[in-house]
């Protein structure tokens, strides 16, 4: 069959018909519908929403829509024993207690089942002791404390401000430093943009607002009790002591009103420099302990949360491909929220809903995509990407053979300034070409393309006239598809101006104030940014599912591989004598990159010239493109991180949200001067160079002429 036989719409109009069907008003309506009550993972409300979405996707015209359920470890506060933190005097009396809940936003005072702020998967405990302020609790913050300031966190309760890195990394760092508890708080320096009012009068965080979130260090494992395998009816579950990634010390989040009360009494060392000061009217002393008059007072945590195996539900919709039904393009985003999910995730779920509706409309008119499109509404993303990971574990054999691409669809907005894209280099040209065809929603760019406004506002640091596209890290549902399975992946959303707004994420992230009204009043009243994101995400899915030749350009991978090789080499060259002493050479890696570049170039030439009417040759070339991402997977995984298997990219070991290139080599080199046994440490660097060079060379060979 030619690719047109599947459709009664001419190829030129396919994409246009799909994009024209997307409506801002529908996204707005769907967002409202999805945000009226909380949809916490594992609750009846979220199950009901799953069934509603299943029903609506069927109505929209998908071929099949099924629920896929799993029984995974979740975490909830104890309803009768609330979590809180207190200051206690020498007699053990509680002289100050933190809030038990956030003041509800206007109009939501009578909503039940709002989960109070908590750190999901915190163990129970009531530690008491002196406080140490650890800034953002990053690796470098603990280096500063322990190495430069000689401050020992062992046996202390640490207080860290949210921001810069994933909260799970903060907790891991605190544990390694010997802390016995962690208090996380939102500092106005990071969560209160100057000149903007706090909610409900603006989009800033009020003093009583608190960020919820999980504090796991799963490293891609999914359900902590069933790593590597689906949490199904016959699953063998680990004991809680063997569970993956659980924190070992109590953790609790607070807002900045409560943080003020703890930090204002801090004594001990002064902050080492201005980068350790936030915006509260407190000295930001590091401690340990309180100052003079208050030195006999201690901090006590009261944490009573419980971990429970609970059923979760993914919704999986299928639109069968007409020509290559065994090739899957996946659009997925999560449905579960901490509270109302006004931005995270429902601004994304509403966009997915409208994309499904548009595809369904085309299908009802007789059109089908060339390849199968799978739509997913994931559950329990907030508890560690559990729904997506369990489904991928259950379907891994199909996915690794049939998975063409995964497009993620969490929050559509984190600001309203410009587009933000993170994706595999294979998708760079797809994203560039698509955004050149879409209209910019930005003020001052009327009649201009999205590509133009995006490039102007977020230029590439390397290539003039091109927009910035970032590496994929983690912290969202693409993780299992990209980092574990090696399926080409991408994500897009509208973002803030990172130059002028240095706060982390958006201020109301994971708080009770993330409501429909937040979006409708302050972020996107016309829902034009949501529509643009729908066009980008939907357009990518459309092209990936419908283009005759897969819209992947392997030459872009060659370019970044050279850049990443240069970067890691320059890091290593900070140790010239050791490179000489231990005979460390990057020649094999640079040689492999050179070979990849040459082979990719030849492959691209063949791609222009081959006979596209020959279905066998077409399928062969497309398979080489599809399997290229897969070729970067090392079946053994990265050291101590078996589910991070991509050799070119992995989540940073110091910040799950960030992507790191050549992560095996990077981690081997990190802080290498502090390793006690240099011969062993440099031996591991050499091994990682070998693994990387072999992988790049092996990937290159998958693009060679097959015979």
């Amino acid at each position: 069959k030619s690719s047109n036989e599947a459709t009664n719409i001419t190829p030129k109009h396919n994409m246009k018909a799909f994009l024209d069907e997307l409506k801002a008003e529908n996204i707005k309506k769907f967002l409202y519908n999805f945000t009226q009550i909380p949809h916490l993972a594992g609750t009846e409300q979220n199950f009901q929403l799953a069934k509603q979405i299943q029903s609506q996707w069927k109505e929209f015209g998908l071929d099949s829509v099924e629920l896929a359920h799993y029984d995974v470890l979740l975490s909830y506060p104890n309803k009768t024993h609330p979590n809180y933190i207190s200051i206690i005097n020498e007699d053990g009396n509680e002289i100050f207690n933190t809030s038990l809940f956030e003041p509800p936003p206007p109009g939501y005072e009578n909503v039940s089942d709002i989960v109070p702020p908590f750190s999901a998967f915190s163990p129970q405990g009531m530690p008491e002791g002196d406080l140490v302020y650890v800034n953002y609790a990053r690796t470098e913050d603990f280096f500063k404390l322990e190495r430069d300031m000689k401050i020992n966190c062992s046996g202390k309760i640490v207080i860290a401000r949210y921001g810069k890195v994933f909260r799970g990394n903060k907790v891991k760092n605190a544990q390694l430093a010997g802390a016995k508890g962690v208090i996380l708080y939102s500092d106005p320096a990071d969560y209160f943009a100057p000149g903007v009012k706090s909610y409900p009068d603006g989009w800033n965080l009020p003093g009583g607002g608190v960020q919820r979130g999980n504090i796991l260090n799963l490293n891609g494992a999914g359900d902590p009790l069933t790593p590597g395998y689906p949490a199904n009816e016959y699953a063998y579950r680990r004991g809680i002591a063997e569970a993956v990634g659980l924190p070992s010390i109590p953790v609790h989040p607070i807002g900045y009103y409560d943080a003020q009360k703890l930090l204002e009494k801090m004594g001990g060392s002064a902050p080492p420099d201005s980068s350790w000061r936030g915006s509260l009217k407190v000295p930001y002393n590091v401690g340990p302990g309180f100052t003079g008059n208050f030195s006999t007072q201690k901090v006590k945590m009261h944490i009573h949360s419980t971990n429970e195996v609970t059923r979760i539900y993914n919704v999986i919709g299928t639109l069968r491909g007409a020509v290559e039904p065994d090739r899957y393009v996946i659009l997925g985003g999560h449905r579960d929220s901490w509270v109302f999910g006004g931005i995270d995730p429902q601004s994304g779920a509403a966009v997915v809903h409208e994309i499904v509706r548009s595809f369904g409309t085309l299908k009802k008119e007789g059109w089908r995509p060339r390849r199968t499109i799978l739509f997913a509404s994931w559950d329990a993303e907030e508890f560690g990407l559990l729904g997506s990971t369990e489904w991928a574990e259950e379907n891994s054999r199909l996915l690794q053979e049939r998975g063409v691409a995964y497009i993620n669809a969490d929050s559509s907005i984190e600001g309203n300034y410009t587009l933000r894209v993170d994706c595999t280099p294979l998708m760079y040209s797809l994203v560039h070409n698509l955004t050149k065809e879409l209209k910019s929603p930005d003020e001052g760019f009327e009649g201009k393309s999205l590509y133009e406004s995006w490039t102007k506002k977020s230029p590439s640091p390397e290539f003039s006239g091109m927009p910035r596209i970032s590496k994929l890290g983690s912290g969202n549902d693409f993780e299992v598809f990209f980092q574990r399975l090696g399926i080409a992946s991408g994500r897009a959303r509208y973002t803030k101006n990172w130059e002028t707004n240095k706060f982390s994420g958006y201020p109301l992230y994971h708080s009770v104030y993330e409501t429909y009204e937040l979006v409708e009043k302050f972020y996107d009243p016309m829902f034009k940014y949501h529509l643009t994101v729908a066009q980008v995400r939907g357009g990518m899915v459309f092209e990936l599912a419908n283009s005759i030749v897969l819209p992947f350009d392997c030459r872009d991978y060659a370019v970044v591989l050279r850049k990443y090789a240069d970067k890691i080499y320059s890091i290593s060259m900070k140790h010239p004598q050791e490179m000489k002493t231990y005979s460390v050479s990057f020649d094999s890696l640079f040689s492999a990159v050179k070979n990849f570049t040459e082979i990719a170039s030849k492959f691209s030439e063949r791609l222009q010239d081959f006979d596209k009417s020959n279905p066998i040759v077409l399928r062969m070339m497309n398979d080489q493109l599809m399997f290229l991402e897969r070729a970067f997977i090392d079946p053994l995984g990265l050291p101590d991180r078996p589910f991070y298997r991509h050799v070119i990219y992995a989540p940073s070991s110091h910040n799950k949200y960030a992507g790191e290139s050549f992560p095996g080599i990077y981690d081997a080199l990190f802080d290498i001067e502090s390793k006690v046994d240099p011969s062993k440490a440099w031996g591991e660097v050499k091994r990682q160079i070998y693994v990387a060079a072999f992988t790049v060379q092996a990937a290159a060979e998958t693009l060679s002429e097959v015979a």
Epitope: K150, N152, K574, H575, Q577, E578, T581, E673
Partner: antibody, heavy 116, light 107 residues
Framework: EVKLEESGGGLVQPGGSMKISCVAS????????MNWVRQTPEKGLEWVAE??????????HYAESVKGRVIISRDDSKSSVYLQMNSLRAEDTAVYYC???????WGQGTTVTVSS | NIVMTQFPKSMSASAGERMTLTCKAS??????VSWYQQKPTQSPKMLIY???NRFTGVPDRFSGSGSGTDFILTISSVQAEDLVDYYC?????????FGGGTKLEMK
Amino acid sequence: EVKLEESGGGLVQPGGSMKISCVASGFTFSNYWMNWVRQTPEKGLEWVAEIRSQSNNFATHYAESVKGRVIISRDDSKSSVYLQMNSLRAEDTAVYYCTRRWNNFWGQGTTVTVSS
Amino acid sequence: NIVMTQFPKSMSASAGERMTLTCKASENVGTYVSWYQQKPTQSPKMLIYGASNRFTGVPDRFSGSGSGTDFILTISSVQAEDLVDYYCGQSYTFPYTFGGGTKLEMK
């Protein structure tokens, strides 16, 4: 191969001064924290001082027994670390070893004798 | 200051025997403990770091264990060249401190 070579030891009178040196080779000296450790038959091994790398602002730390009397310094261009010892006492008599961070590599030592 | 106490001060061994040397810290030092071997007229050489990791080039008859306050160096089958002095040391906090040493002698 990592090598540390101390020099400059000898006999000095109580109250006198002495500067001992250590030249390093086989590693990128500027990245590493360096220590002086001394050894006597009576007291055994005793850590004396540490100097950190440029990325740690060349921070220095001293044992209480020598604080105010010794200064540790380094010259990364010469891959050298020094220990300037003032107001020397009989109890400072020892073999002084230059060591790399974590005391994973030691020089052969230089003997300092404080005696009248 | 953290005091590192080694005992016994000396012990006798025959070739092929299994020997256990003990080091006790006066307070918790995690696993920041190293063991050193010193031969006559030579400087100390690292054997074990991080309480249980064998340093490069050290024969596998040497092993370390322990955490917190109690640490052990084990020589599974003593050789003649092992009959020298052994020291433990902590790098957990300032000032870095060493034990008084254990001398292994011929039985």
